[in-house]
Interface confidence: low
């Protein structure tokens, strides 16, 4: 598409004849008819192919026409054409003397025509005009002519449509030979696809417009680059989105459970070991002095009857004394100056004399001891439960009643619940102080995952774009399979696709 | 807002007709191709049919040559396909695109589609 334009430029008839050298009356009006045809080797009448035009009346015999309009009609004159400029022409140029103010050809007498010039021959599209000028025996006529294409037209042949836009189909302007060019932040072949903020990932991260970084569900920070955690994930990170990778020490499917005890809360008093039994669990191996579940208890050193044969004990700063009844010496009070001579058992204590009669040794009856089976048995003086146990007297014997946990003769054993695999369905055990927990999988619970609880993960329509959705039976939650055109965990995002097709 | 709303799809015996729509909205509908590519559940989208903005370039796939047949009424902004002599093999989704250009190029914006069945 584009117009031949004309340019008019002076037109010279001295004497004011008509072609038929006929004076005109007073002077010749003159105007002008134009037809533009395609290419003929001789110029022949007939349908003006690619268009006329007609001025008004331009003055008279002889006159320069102005480059404005003028009375109406226009200068340059105007021949569009809806085509490919074929690059090459005929042009008739008629000028007609206008008796009265009715210029159409009908109201005209037949000799009213001044001159008549014919031309043909190539023509490209440009910018620059070309001068010509027609001289016949009577008049001359100088002018001159282009081709240029119409708004949004380029090419050689204005046969290339480009109209700059900047909306939903493209971004962009148009270069002298029809090509795009981009605007500021815009790409691709029509310039429809956004250039992202510098450094948005490529795969996490899109943009709507220039310089933006959208993130992708599950990722987030300027550049999309860093992964969004499990929704409740409290010790842990993600290297892919809605994970939870716990940290040293921390368990559980939230890593919310802690599993070095020791090191985070130091239950241990007095210099004790700490070691860690599980999930909140620890034991305290205690140093000399000390006891209780945590070794927060003093231990006094008379407290372990050191003393025998009937001695008292004093507790002292650097340990203890004993005071030995009459007969007895040592330490511990452990030597003896009786013998069996002395009746020195108690409690019917049976005698048995030493190192020849010098020393002597009481064997005592049962719920009885000491050197001269003076005491009556006490089993639970020497605190022989271990991690908080209470120390029963049982006749000649004790028993310890262990604190939920423990087992063993003296409380020793730690006792796992956990070790009868209690929970059912693929649940998680948890050993706790007073018993166990179970925590279970997706799809099940109870106080030991017994009971069935699947639920339908697609009955809330979560996913959009006439996508399907299937539930996944090991975790009870959804996916969604998009249809062409949609990307997103929920299908939500429209993309604009590649041209995959054959067209 | 760009949107392509198809319609005219449904259950048809192996032999049949049927004609789909695509009303188009949120442009300058003269200045755009729009085509219909289908995609039958597991498998790939096929582009099956185009017509360019001027309504004079128009595309068929092989699968469906001689048997289908795009139309366009810019007045109405609607993009038609007639489809004859269907076959089993042609139950699919059908859906309406434009590449956002005059020329069959590629797509930018697609309907929600249609569903066409062929069973006897």
């Known amino acids: 598409s584009g117009v031949f334009q004309l340019q008019l430029q002076e037109f010279i008839n001295e004497r004011g004849v008509l072609a038929s050298g006929r004076p005109c009356e007073p002077g010749c009006r003159t105007f002008f008819r134009v037809c533009l045809k395609h290419f003929q080797a001789v110029v022949s009448p007939g349908p003006c192919t690619f268009g006329t035009v007609s001025t008004p009346v331009l003055g008279t015999n002889s006159f320069a026409v102005r480059d404005d309009s003028s009375g109406g009609g226009r200068n340059p004159l105007q021949l569009p054409f809806n085509f490919t400029w074929p690059g090459t022409f005929s042009l008739i140029i008629e000028a007609w003397h206008a008796p009265g103010d009715d210029l159409r050809p009908e109201a005209l007498p037949p000799d009213a025509l001044i001159s008549k010039i014919a031309i043909q021959g190539s023509l490209a599209v440009g910018q620059n005009w070309l001068l010509d000028e027609q001289t016949s025996t009577l008049t001359r006529l100088r002018y001159s002519y282009r081709v240029i294409c119409s708004d949004n037209y380029y090419g050689d042949n204005c046969s290339r449509l480009c109209k700059k836009r900047n909306d939903h189909f493209g971004h962009y302007v148009c270069q002298p030979d029809g090509n795009l060019s981009c605007l500021p932040g815009w790409t691709g072949e029509y310039c429809q696809q956004p250039i992202c903020l510098s450094g948005c990932h490529e795969q996490n991260g899109y943009c709507s417009k220039p310089a933006e970084c959208l993130c992708r569900p599950g990722w987030q920070g300027r550049l999309c680059n860093e992964c969004i955690p499990h929704n409740g994930c409290r010790h842990g990170t993600c290297s892919t989105p809605w994970q939870c990778t716990c940290d040293e020490g921390w368990g559980g499917l939230f890593c919310d459970q802690d599993l070095n005890y020791c090191t985070h809360h130091s239950p241990c008093k007095n210099g004790a070991t700490c070691s860690n039994s599980g999930q909140r669990s620890y034991t305290c191996t205690c140093r000399p002095g000390y006891t209780g579940v945590d070794c927060e208890l003093e231990l006094s050193e008379c407290d372990s009857n050191p003393c025998r044969n009937g001695g008292s004990c004093k507790d002292q700063e650097d340990g203890y004394h004993c005071l030995c009844p009459p007969g007895y010496y040592g330490l511990h009070c452990e030597h003896s100056t009786l013998s069996c001579a002395d009746s020195p058992c108690f409690n019917g204590g049976s005698c048995r004399e030493r190192n020849q009669g010098a020393n002597y040794a009481c064997e005592c009856p049962p719920n009885f001891t000491g050197s001269n089976c003076e005491k009556k048995v006490d089993r639970c003086t020497s605190n022989p439960c271990a991690n908080g146990g209470q120390c029963l007297n049982r006749g000649p014997s004790r028993m310890c009643r262990c604190r939920p946990g423990f087992t063993g003769t003296y409380c020793e054993l730690h006792v796992s619940d956990c070790a009868r695999n209690p929970c059912a369905h693929g649940g998680t055990c948890h050993d706790l102080e007073n018993g166990l927990m179970c925590t279970c999988p997706a799809g099940f619970s109870g106080r030991r995952c017994e009971v069935r609880t699947s639920i339908d993960a697609c009955a809330s329509s979560p996913c959009f774009n006439r996508a399907t959705c299937y539930t996944d039976l090991s975790t009870d939650t959804f996916v969604c399979n998009c249809p062409y055109g949609f990307v997103g965990s929920r299908c939500e995002f429209p993309v604009g696709l590649p041209p995959s097709f054959p067209w | 807002e760009v949107q392509l709303v198809e319609s005219g799809g449904g259950l048809v015996q192996p032999g049949g007709s049927l004609r789909l729509s695509c009303a188009a909205s949120g442009f300058t509908f003269d200045d755009y191709a729009i085509g219909w590519f289908r995609q039958a559940p597991g498998k790939e989208p096929e582009g099956i049919s185009c017509i360019s903005s001027s309504g004079g370039i128009t595309y068929y796939a092989d699968s469906v040559k001689g048997r289908f047949t795009i139309s366009r009424d810019n007045a109405k902004s609607t993009v038609y396909l007639q489809m004859n002599s269907l076959k089993p093999e042609d139950t699919a989704v059908y859906y309406c695109?434009?590449?956002?250009?005059?020329?069959?190029?590629?797509?930018?914006?697609t309907g929600q589609g249609t569903q066409v069945t062929v069973s006897s």
């Open positions: 695109a434009t590449p956002g250009i005059a020329a069959c190029r590629g797509i930018h914006y």
